[in-house]
Interface confidence: low
């Protein structure tokens, strides 16, 4: 298996191929960057920023009606969320369900085999505690850039201000508060899949200091799912320092969307399943990860797992065959969209309708079976890829026929036999799907019977002969008659007709050669004769 390229590949160009082995259902994928906000406790405000895609997608391929002329597979994806700092108490990092995603951008793509569906980059919010008793501030979250980048807004903790104003008002130029400066700060998390660490960049703030260090030097090589509290942030233009908390998301490559649709049900079902790979739940609190999965136009069908991540299947049944469904699958981290996949799934070919066959006017050993051209009903049945025609008397024989055939001459039949013909149409989708078999019956005409078997002659007395035989292998007709013709010296002597093959011929001439010919008559045709020669004895009296 070839390795997947790391997320360090160029972020200014499109996504690279991800080689895979076992093909999975390829789905047209529209990875839409989240542009949502996370609200902290006490927050009443939500802001939206248009999202920009950042993760590396597998092989991108054109998708009709794409909203963008070219699919950028590696732009940075940002989303911001704002949280109000609660008064006096630290804000826990909870979040509400994210609202919808405005400004979505279509990123056409295909799903690589086995990794399943490409994941969008996360955008995660951090919460920070606030310590100002006198006011609250809006805090923004972050975004992930590079291979996988995520943006969340960080709430900041306000420094305590003196509540005793001076008795005299003096006009002074004061620095901006760091709480105000960092209150709406956007943080870009950049995921390096090669070593599975994150780098956090404080956007639009020059020379940010984390404690006494440059933030640039501090906020890299962050472990996924780590939580960094009370980071003191400031810069030359603000005072006093404020604190922020960072909640580093899981790597987006830890989540993959898999098709779990059983092939047998793929015509009327869609099954999707989020799976995690190498996600350490000891480090990553599964309570922070949830998912939503639903497909349109089945509006009322949704699979939701809130507040804890347990991989499970979401199967939608009773869908229409050969129909496009748009499925939206999201992973949320701390209530903020981390991964979003929009995939177009086409249900498999439907079960075809089988036309009613007509068995025609049979001959003794063949007949023509014909059927009408199928009428295409795209809403339910698919046009057949072929037919299977079977015919049986005692044993069954089947023949596979192409879909451009509407008749078939069944040959090598046995005369005067009842046959049942069954015709079924099939399509080749993920599996061969057979329509319901339609039947017709026929009876072949009679034909000449075979010769009698085991003919024997014996002489019970000097001038009488017994003739016996068994039935032919195939009588090929409705009736059973055995015909015995007795000849002598080339001349006709006598003729018998019986329904069984036991003849007693007496009163023959003594010491005479006779020819005994037995044939079978089936009520329509007489078969060939079997001949035995026998002589009478001299008269012993």
């Amino acid at each position: 298996q070839t390795p997947t390229p790391s997320d360090e590949l160029s972020t200014t160009e499109n996504a690279l191929l991800l080689p895979q082995s076992d093909p999975l259902p390829a789905r047209t994928t529209e990875s839409t960057p989240p542009s949502i906000s996370e609200r902290g406790n006490g927050s009443s405000e939500t802001t939206y920023h248009p999202g920009v895609l950042s993760t590396l997608l597998p092989h991108l391929s054109p998708q009709p009606d794409s909203q963008t002329p070219s699919a950028g597979g590696a732009d940075t994806q940002t989303f911001s969320s704002q949280a109000d700092n609660p008064t006096l108490t630290p804000a826990p990092g909870g979040g509400t369900d994210p609202p919808g995603v405005p400004g979505e951008r279509t990123v056409p793509g295909t799903i690589p085999a086995d990794t399943a569906f490409p994941v969008d980059t996360p955008s995660l919010a951090r919460n920070s505690s606030a310590a100002s008793p006198t006011h609250t501030s809006n805090v923004s979250t972050t975004d992930i850039s590079s291979g996988a980048s995520l943006t969340t807004l960080t709430p900041s903790t306000l420094g305590l201000a003196s509540t005793d104003p001076p008795s005299t008002t003096i006009a002074t130029t004061t620095k901006q508060t760091c709480a105000a400066m960092f209150g709406n700060i956007t943080v870009n998390y950049t995921y390096e899949s090669s070593n599975q660490t994150f780098k956090a960049d404080l956007k639009d703030v020059q020379n940010a200091k984390c404690g006494n260090e440059d933030c640039e030097n501090v906020l890299n090589n962050l472990e996924e799912c780590s939580q960094i509290k009370n980071i003191s942030v400031s810069n030359d233009s603000c005072a006093p320092a404020t604190t922020i908390d960072l909640y580093v998301p899981p790597g987006t490559d830890k989540f993959s969307l898999h098709d779990c649709t059983p092939k047998e049900k793929a015509n009327t079902s869609i099954c999707l399943e989020w799976k995690t790979k190498n996600l350490d739940f000891r480090k990553c609190n599964s309570d922070n990860i949830s998912y939503v999965l639903h497909c349109e136009p089945e509006n009322n069908t949704k699979c939701i797992r809130r507040n804890t991540f347990i991989p499970e299947r979401c199967q939608l049944d009773n869908l229409r065959a050969q129909t496009n469904y748009t499925c939206v699958a999201e992973i949320l981290y701390r209530g903020v969209k981390l991964v979003k996949n929009v995939i177009n799934v086409q249900t498999d070919l439907g079960i075809p309708e089988t036309p009613k066959p007509s068995c025609g006017d049979p001959a003794a050993r063949k007949t023509l079976v014909s059927w009408p051209e199928p009428v295409s009903k795209p809403e339910s049945a698919s046009k057949p890829h072929g037919y299977v025609l079977c015919y049986k008397n005692n044993s069954e024989k089947c023949k596979s026929l192409p879909n451009n055939v509407t008749s078939f001459e069944v040959e090598s039949l046995k005369p005067y036999k009842y046959y049942e013909v069954s015709l079924l149409a099939y399509v080749n989708g993920k599996i061969q799907r057979n329509g319901t078999a339609e039947k017709c019956n026929f009876h072949t005409k009679a034909d000449r019977p075979d010769k009698v078997n085991g003919m024997k002659t014996s002489r019970p007395t000097d001038n009488s002969i017994n003739v016996t035989c068994g039935p032919p292998y195939e009588t090929n007709g409705p009736k059973t008659f055995y015909i015995l013709v007795v000849r002598s010296g080339g001349s006709f002597v006598t003729k018998y007709n019986k329904t069984n093959c036991q003849f007693y011929v007496d009163n023959l001439y003594y010491s005479t050669d006779y020819e005994f010919l037995v044939s079978f008559h089936n009520g329509v045709y007489e078969g060939d004769s079997v001949i035995r020669n026998e002589s009478t004895n001299f008269n012993a009296k």
Epitope: L17, P19, S21, L24, P25, H59, S61, P112, A113, D259
Partner: nanobody, 119 residues
Framework: QVQLVQSGGGLVQPGGSLRLSCAAS????????MGWYRQAPGSQRELVAS??????SYADAVKGRFTISRDYAKNIIYLQMNSLKPDDTAVYFC??????????????WGQGTQVTVSG
């Protein structure tokens, strides 16, 4: 089935150029994504460049030196390799990935072309 036939490659001195081509036959493939991978002895196969829907991507190691292009009419992709380095020595594989309306994707690979950069 898609057949990928690669040509080009060979021995070149450092700083030199080579052009690889990969022709796909058996099925129209305009909607497929195509790319080049390489595998040096003892190493894993790595992505070099890909092109899909007219958009090209490159691995950092080759950016600015290699150019991937695609002739949609002839079902051929090319990899123009300039300023070659000894590190570029590898077997180069053409990759074709197509997506079906039924929902499945398939990968096809070329037979591989040896590129040796040596002084």
């Amino acid at each position: 089935q898609v057949q990928l036939v690669q040509s080009g490659g060979g021995l070149v001195q450092p700083g030199g150029s080579l052009r690889l081509s990969c022709a796909a036959s058996g099925r129209a493939f305009n909607s497929a994504a195509m790319g080049w991978y390489r595998q040096a002895p003892g190493s894993q196969r790595e992505l070099v460049a890909s092109i899909s829907a007219g958009t090209a991507s490159y691995a950092d190691a080759v950016k600015g030196r290699f150019t991937i292009s695609r002739d949609y009419a002839k079902n051929i992709i090319y990899l123009q390799m300039n300023s070659l380095k000894p590190d570029d020595t590898a077997v180069y594989f053409c990759n074709y990935r197509t997506t079906y309306t039924s929902g499945y994707s398939e990968d096809y690979w070329g037979q591989g072309t040896q590129v040796t950069v040596s002084g």
